[in-house]
């Protein structure tokens, strides 16, 4: 079942995913100048039966100015540098990653890609939360965020991390104001909910080894 | 309590556009997403698409890509969804339904009829 | 895509019947929800998550299924039942309906 709201938003942190759950989407988006092919389907989706799971159906970009074929086109400078991270971003993912029964690894990039990933997860998925370079956490509980479904509604778990910069003093500093809790949920269930965009994420490679060496950048 | 109300029906002409908006009270209308539902007269429900209204976000139907443009105005809690080309089987009621699962709420829809 | 398949189309019945839906996905799905629709009104939420009465909803409407194969059932049909009937999954995208079940009178 689709999350039909958002992993929370906390202020200057990053949010991934390790592994995605059987029935997560990951939208098949092209850059600038490149679109799907016709052909092609407009997601990628993890599958998988009792033993393995993999991505299926391919993303594929073809110029926009061409008709109907998959050339290759020689990227710009600044393009080959994205393709570059992106590739390397893979590479390390694939050291970092566990295999999970049931669930998919990051999907490997596809030429012309766009620099955003749209991720649709489903319910169960788990995300891990990190603070941004330049701010260090304050635990009060688990760094993640779970979706869940209570009376056919999905509803993300807070997580229990707040950033501060390295220069703020050591204290829990006053989070963000929290949306309304849907109605029907008590507030005691929902801590905080955030049902805006799907999970556009951007792939940037991390300053840091420590945690994530593959980061996701919550838009 | 929750609502949704939507526009008025519409007649239009084929080839011209129109827009149809969905007013949410009741909730935090940036907390949900809002759904495009299409039923042409005698048929059945088709989904077209959603926004999340903080961001702006869409996603499709792809049958309905270049068919519909959902919008959402934050400040007065209203969601549109703009119906482009219109053709004599864009004729159909359409309605808002408030996401975050399934669908709990519903607009009372809006007959777009397209006749020369 | 996946396909919803609902049998019968149409179901003549009396008040006091027991009456099945059955809907059919191409693919296996993780929940079906049900929604009743009476002519001119909008959809209703019936059923949530294969089996769970949404709010309001009398008792003798009920829901089971797993995979590709699910079903509602009204076991003593009133009169205010006869209305069309659709099943919904929202697995995966595009969102999907059957194509409706009316349950009229006998």
């Known amino acids: 079942e689709l999350c039909d709201d958002d992993p929370p938003k906390i202020t200057h942190a990053t949010f991934k995913a390790v592994a995605y759950k059987e029935g997560t989407m990951l939208n098949c988006e092209c850059k600038r100048g490149f679109r799907r092919i016709k052909s092609g389907s407009p997601y990628m989706l993890c599958t998988g039966n009792s033993s393995h799971s993999s991505w299926d159906n391919q993303c594929q970009c073809t110029s926009s100015a061409a008709r109907n074929t998959t050339k290759q086109v020689t990227p710009q400078p600044e393009e080959q540098k994205e393709r570059k991270t992106t590739e390397m971003q893979s590479q390390m993912q694939l050291a970092d990653q566990v295999s999970l029964p049931g669930h998919c690894r990051e999907p490997p990039p596809w030429e012309n890609e766009a620099t955003e990933r749209i991720y649709h997860f489903v319910v169960g998925q788990t995300v891990y939360y990190q603070c941004v370079q330049g701010y260090r956490a304050l635990h009060r509980g688990p760094a993640e965020s779970v979706c869940k479904m209570t009376h056919g509604k999905t509803r993300w778990t807070q997580p229990q991390l707040i950033c501060t910069g390295e220069t703020e003093p050591s204290q829990f500093p006053g989070e963000e104001e929290p949306q309304a809790s849907p109605d029907g949920l008590p507030e005691s269930e929902t801590s905080r909910l955030v049902t805006t965009t799907d999970f556009r994420i951007q792939t940037e490679v991390a300053a840091t080894m420590e945690t994530f060496i593959f980061t996701t950048e919550y838009q | 309590q929750v609502q949704l109300v939507q526009s008025g029906a519409e007649v239009k002409k084929p080839g011209s556009s129109v827009k149809v908006s969905c007013k949410a009270s009741g909730y935090t209308f940036t907390s949900y997403r809002m759904h495009w539902v299409r039923q042409a007269p005698g048929q059945g429900l088709e989904w077209m698409g959603y926004i999340s209204p903080r961001k702006g976000y869409t996603e499709y139907n792809q049958k309905f890509k270049d068919k519909a443009t959902i919008t959402a105005d934050e400040s007065t809690n209203t969601a549109y969804m703009e119906l482009s080309s219109l053709r004599s089987e864009d004729t159909a009621v359409y309605y808002c339904?408030?996401?975050?699962?399934?669908?709990?709420?519903w607009g009372q829809g809006t007959l777009v009829t397209v006749s020369s | 895509d996946i396909q919803m398949t609902q049998s019968p189309s149409t179901l003549s019945a009396s008040v006091g019947d027991r009456v099945t839906i059955t809907c059919s996905a191409s693919?296996?799905?993780?929940?079906m929800h049900w929604y009743q629709q009476k002519p001119g009104k909008a959809p209703k939420l019936l059923i949530y998550?294969?089996?769970n009465l949404a709010s309001g909803v009398p008792a003798r409407f009920s829901g089971s299924g797993s995979g590709t194969e699910f079903t509602l059932t009204i076991s003593s049909l009133q009169p205010d039942d006869f209305a069309t009937y659709y099943c919904?999954?929202?697995?995966?995208?595009?969102?999907?309906f059957g194509q409706g079940t009316k349950v009229e009178v006998k």
């Open positions: 339904a408030r996401g975050g699962g399934v669908f709990d709420y």
């Open positions: 998550t294969t089996s």
């Open positions: 919904h999954q929202r697995s995966t995208y595009p969102l999907t």
């Open positions: 693919s296996s799905i993780s929940y």
